[in-house]
């Protein structure tokens, strides 16, 4: 007996379409081996209408595909515009058409209800507007115009000229007449119901001369797009409703077990706890379409998802979706990285971010979330080098360790740093992930001094202070500029033996500038790492001012007092929207920290690591 | 609250039929999937036929056991299926119940892609 299954019998009606699920047993063979639907002929030949690796015969063309689903071991053969020469009997199966591992399906399509001659089809999702077109001879203009709705053997009037509408269509249709010579009236439904499926007649005039036109109106529920997304992923939902509702109230809900949807993000504000930092809808086009973004994907985000427009934000009958069936991928491509990371305050975090490995050139991004209405994500940094003005000195995106993940680092935390931050590129953007930064009690352990003065043509000497664990570790001193930290070159005064046995009084790297310069002015940055894994930073800023002469006075560059806690968003802030996440240059403009100068020389900055057992000693 | 009710069960000789049907009350909207297991005694639940609709077609699911034998029909409308049981044998005896989806994710011969069910109707075949 043959390990796939499916529907032994489909049935449908002409130009409606079928989704065909077929499932395998998902070994890792099953799973990346071809799959096919194929027709018998005949000559008991089994010919590939369209397979996973891309084929779709010419008959199928433009109205069928195939979708693998490894993970649930399914794939799915979708055929749209039916005709009654579909009939007949089908396989679907794995690997070639000609051996046993397949299933057959009979496909049955009908003819439909028989419509009286002449009836015009409309075929239209739940929600939508439908535009019922209703001719009419010359001599039938003054007259009464009318829809009917066909029940049984009876015709229930809907709308006329003379103002009368049927209580179940009120406030959602009207008849329209056009001017003279213009010999076709119209009637406009909106919010289509499931309910107003049916046959409809128009009738102009009465009596014997009376014109009738019959009208087939096909109510559909949308069927939901399978959208399969990686653990830890992320999802966008492009939700495009028409103009008709581009004013209302948006929203995205998922479908609970008793069939009702539980909103997960409305443009009114509201937003499901689950989805916290992880959710951004984003603002909406002319034509009302939006989109819904959703990173650190979670099985339990699996489920049927719906958009849709109604002024209360949330799911009403009658008002337009679009519908999707997520299912999350365990066997996700996207490495794990922690999703929460703590940092003290006045402290650091080091966090890694995955990226497609795929695309080590693209961009690379980190954003802030911010949860007020909507979501947002105004950027903070960006490989290119830019940082948002007030995390100047603190905040720097490396490509360590490259190969699919680089690393943002964010010092001198304060309680205002704990949040949701998302690490995103201007590539795939389902590699899009969210971590969460929290501030926990405790001391920073890396200690430098505060904001450092130094004089011109004078040798300046910066002590960090580290803690035993840290004595395997490498330490090293660098200048931060807005296009990241330039580690300063070490001096090499000894053994690297010299923190083997570690003193708790003074373990320490040291950074010389000697002679100070102007260009030394600017932030440096004090770290330990393991290869290209970056551990805890602490920073400095080191003010440069002429040697005193008598009446002079020092004034402390704004940068260096800059109130710990200052942290604004301006609204010139770039934002995550569809289209920049394509193309970043598309985000809006933005003042760009200028770059604080030249790299102090080689020869001039030097770096000591020194213990009380042994002065010098490696800057590992 | 949501119930089906299945009917038709009984007694019957060996290459008789049966009808068996299924109704769904306490829903405010249709069933995307309706389907029948059936249990022997001692035995596990195992997946009989399964009837699923969307749109405007229907999609029917049989196991290699019954195919040929049995046929499943029904109404998403009514939120009723029935179940037209043929040549019976000794191996159809069991209480078949009758399982209910609002969707039809899952594979349809796993209790799990199945949220309401019946309590159940025994059907025997004697020799």
């Known amino acids: 007996k043959s390990p796939v299954f499916g529907p032994q019998e489909v049935s449908s009606v002409e130009g409606n379409s079928v989704s065909i699920k077929c499932y395998y047993p998902p070994t890792s063979v099953n799973r990346h081996t071809r799959k096919y639907w194929c027709r018998k002929g005949a000559s008991g030949r089994c010919i590939t209408l369209v397979s996973s690796e891309g084929y779709v015969s010419s008959n199928y063309a433009g109205r069928a595909n195939l979708t693998n689903f490894p993970e649930n071991g399914t794939f799915v053969v979708n055929i749209a515009q039916l005709s009654r020469d579909d009939s007949g009997h089908y396989k679907c199966g794995l690997g070639i058409n000609s051996r046993g591992l397949s299933f057959d399906v009979s496909l049955e399509v009908s003819q439909g209800p028989e419509l009286p001659n002449g009836t015009e089809v409309y075929t239209v999702d739940v929600g939508r507007t439908v535009t019922i077109k209703c001719p009419f001879k010359t001599e039938n203009a003054p007259k009464t115009k009318a829809l009917y709705k066909k029940i049984g053997q009876t015709s229930v009037l809907v709308i006329d000229s003379r103002n009368y509408v049927n209580p179940n269509y009120k406030d959602r249709i009207r008849l329209r007449i056009p001017g003279t010579g213009q010999l076709i009236f119209t009637v406009v439904i909106d919010r289509l119901r499931l309910s107003d499926h049916g046959l409809y007649l128009c009738q102009a005039g009465d009596g014997s001369n009376r014109d009738e036109k019959n009208a087939d109106l096909q109510v559909l529920e949308p069927e939901p797009e399978l959208v399969y997304e990686d653990l830890r992923g992320s999802v966008t939902f492009h939700c495009a409703l028409g103009l008709e509702v581009a004013n209302v109230a948006k929203f995205l809900c998922r479908v609970n077990s008793r069939e009702t949807c539980d909103v997960v993000i409305n443009t009114l504000g509201k937003r499901d706890s689950a989805f916290e930092g992880r959710i951004l809808l984003n603002p909406q086009d002319k034509d009302g379409s939006f989109s819904v973004v959703i990173t650190g994907l979670r099985k339990e985000d699996e489920g049927r998802y719906l958009c849709g427009a109604h002024s209360d934000g949330q799911l009403q009958e009658g008002w337009p979706i679009q519908a999707w069936q997520l299912f999350v991928n365990e066997e996700s491509t996207i490495p794990r990285s922690p999703t929460v990371v703590k940092g003290v305050a006045g402290g650091s975090v080091a966090v890694l971010c995955p990226y497609n490995p795929k695309e080590s050139q693209s961009l690379k991004y980190w954003c802030l979330w911010e949860g007020a209405q909507n979501g947002r994500c105004p950027l903070l940094v960006e490989s290119q080098g830019l940082v948002q003005e007030q995390y100047e000195g603190r905040l720097s995106l490396l490509q360590e360790p490259g190969n699919g993940t680089f690393t943002v680092i964010l010092n001198q935390l304060t309680t205002q740093d704990a949040g949701f931050y998302w690490c995103l590129t201007n590539g795939d953007t389902r590699w899009r992930t969210t971590v969460e930064i929290k501030i926990i009690e405790g001391e920073p352990n890396l200690k430098v001094p505060g904001n450092v003065t130094a004089v011109l043509g004078e040798t300046l000497n910066i002590p960090c202070h580290f803690p035993c664990k840290f004595s395997s570790y490498e330490k090293y001193w660098c200048k931060w500029s807005n296009t990241g930290c330039q580690t300063l070159p070490s001096q090499d005064e000894g053994p690297s033996e010299a923190f083997v046995n570690c003193d708790e009084n003074s373990r320490l790297v040291s950074l010389t500038l000697n002679p100070v310069t102007r260009a030394d002015e600017g932030w440096y940055w004090c770290g330990v790492k393991q290869g290209h894994f970056y551990g805890e930073t602490a920073a400095v800023y080191v003010a440069v001012e002429e040697k005193k002469v008598a009446g002079s006075r020092y004034v402390s560059p704004a940068k260096a007092d800059a109130a710990p806690d200052e942290k604004v968003l301006d609204s010139g802030v770039r934002e995550i929207e569809n289209k920049a996440i394509q193309d970043p240059r598309l985000f809006a403009e933005e003042k760009v920290v200028a770059d604080t100068g030249d790299q102090a020389g080689g020869s001039r900055a030097s770096v000591d690591s020194s213990s009380s057992e042994e002065q010098g000693g490696s800057s590992k | 609250e949501v119930q089906l009710v299945e009917s038709g069960g009984g007694v019957v000789q060996a290459e008789d039929s049966l009808r068996l049907s299924c109704a769904a009350s306490?829903?405010?909207?249709?069933?995307?999937?309706m389907g029948w297991f059936r249990q022997a005694p001692g035995k596990e639940r195992e997946f009989v036929a399964t009837?699923?609709?969307?749109?405007?077609?229907?999609?029917?699911y049989y196991d290699d056991s019954v195919k040929g034998r049995f046929a499943v029909s029904g109404d998403n409308t009514k939120n009723t299926m029935n179940l037209q049981m043929k040549g019976l044998n000794l191996e159809d005896t069991g209480v078949y119940y009758c399982?209910?989806?609002?969707?039809?994710?899952?594979?349809?011969?796993?209790?799990?892609?199945?949220?309401?069910w019946g309590q159940g109707t025994q059907v025997t075949v004697s020799s």
């Open positions: 306490g829903l405010s909207f249709s069933l995307s999937r």
């Open positions: 399982a209910a989806n609002p969707n039809n994710y899952g594979d349809p011969r796993t209790p799990g892609a199945y949220q309401y």
């Open positions: 009837i699923e609709w969307s749109g405007r077609s229907t999609y029917k």
